[in-house]
């Protein structure tokens, strides 16, 4: 039986809440790493790959040591929403070409969605200001060629990998300060 009606809910332990978010983030990071290895193995592509529609890498948002929890969570959620949209786009636009990366891409999409819901929950439990819903983003143009799609896949997974590393480092650092 839970607390009697009308009694205040036990306030969440912020360290435990943050910790479970870190664990989901690390798990997704490992999925992304494995998928990146597969992509590089099956579709080698040298050099850096960029996609203008991807968010600017979070690490340019300032030194990790100076960041505060609300700004990290807000930035992370916004960036991951963009990556989720790009993974969905990639699966739709490149379904046949990237079929060797299924079901891993599907699993990645599911886990990305789960982490986003976890971040939303964490922000509400820590009573952080909720963001207004994002305005609908313009649709992503289909890749101009199969090769263009493969380069986009490299850019998406590479950017997501770096973003998740930034998140793990930032969240664990913030956890030590709580």
């Amino acid at each position: 039986p839970g607390p009697p009606p009308g009694s205040p809910r036990a306030s969440p332990d912020p360290r435990a809440e943050l910790d479970s978010t870190v664990l989901l983030t690390r798990s997704l990071l490992e999925d992304t790493r494995q998928l990146t290895i597969q992509l590089k193995d099956k579709f080698p592509a040298d050099g850096d790959h960029n996609l203008d529609s991807l968010p600017t890498l979070a690490m340019s948002a300032g030194a990790l040591g100076a960041l505060q929890l609300p700004s990290v969570l807000t930035r992370l959620r916004a960036d991951l929403l963009s990556y989720l949209r790009h993974v969905q786009w990639l699966r739709r636009a490149m379904g046949s070409s990237l079929k060797t990366l299924e079901p891993e891409l599907g699993t990645l999409q599911t886990r990305l969605d789960r982490l986003l819901r976890r971040l939303q929950l964490l922000m509400s439990r820590l009573a952080l200001p909720q963001l207004p819903p994002d305005p609908p983003a313009p649709p992503l143009a289909p890749p101009s060629s199969t090769w263009g799609g493969i380069r986009a896949a490299h850019a998406i997974l590479g950017g997501l990998h770096l973003t998740l590393d930034w998140a793990v480092r930032g969240l664990l650092l913030l956890k030590t300060r709580l």
Partner: antibody, heavy 119, light 111 residues
């Protein structure tokens, strides 16, 4: 061949600073973090901190915050660690090590740089 | 900080024997299917070398006689049949939280 090559041994006086370099080759520098580890005689290995070459600044073990400064020169695939206000307890071998993103395990190590602090 | 305690501090065995090294953490370093413990080998005058990552994954190029196991707070590095080149000091390290910390080491010596 993937390797990390560190600068040579240093002898410093108490209160001075030392800056060690670590040149990476054989892999994409920005695909991994660069970590720094201290090994003092008779002591366990100690993690100093790490830096992601893409940016965002370093993170430090609280024990070294304020005295250690980690930087990178992306164009030269080189990482640096500066340690200031040296004292005798800083006498140790310092290693740079390649860190897997988000996991802090170190699969490639530099050969180590011996720093001796003595008056 | 999480404290890692290795045992024994030293171990004398002969080539061909099986070595079992232990690492105990002051709190659980396992969660969500991952155990954040890694094992290194170090020989005098050399840098550490990664053997096992995430408790049981063999690093590329490391002989199959090395294996890692365990979860929660108790972990083991096993060398199934010792070779001459295996006599060295072995360290465990965790990466569950910041800062990552290392055990004090187990020195494996020839009997």
């Amino acid at each position: 061949e993937v390797q990390l090559v560190q600068s040579g041994a240093e002898v410093k006086k108490p209160g001075a600073s030392v800056k060690i370099s670590c040149k990476a080759s054989g892999y994409t520098f920005t695909d991994y973090n660069m970590d720094w580890v201290k090994q003092a005689p008779g002591q366990r290995l100690e993690w100093i901190g790490d830096i992601n070459p893409h940016g965002g600044g370093p993170i430090y073990n609280q024990k070294f915050t304020g005295r250690a400064t980690l930087t990178v020169d992306k164009s030269a695939s080189t990482a640096y660690m500066e340690l200031s206000s040296l004292r005798s307890e800083d006498t140790a071998v310092y290693y740079c090590a390649r860190g897997e993103l988000g996991h802090w395990y170190f699969d490639v190590w530099g050969q180590g740089t011996t720093v001796t602090v003595s008056s | 900080d999480i404290v890692l305690t290795q045992s024994p501090a030293s171990l004398a065995l002969s080539p061909g024997e099986r070595a079992t090294l232990s690492c105990r953490a002051s709190k659980s370093v396992s969660t969500s299917g991952y155990s954040y413990i890694h094992w290194y080998q170090q020989k005098p005058g050399q840098a550490p070398r990664l053997l096992i990552y995430l408790a049981s994954n063999l690093e590329s190029g490391v002989p199959a006689r090395f294996s890692g196991s365990g979860s929660g707070t108790d972990f083991t590095l096993t060398i199934s049949s010792l070779e001459e080149e295996d006599f060295a000091t072995y360290y465990c390290q965790h990466s569950r939280d910041l800062p990552p910390t290392f055990g004090q080491g187990t020195k494996l010596e020839i009997k």
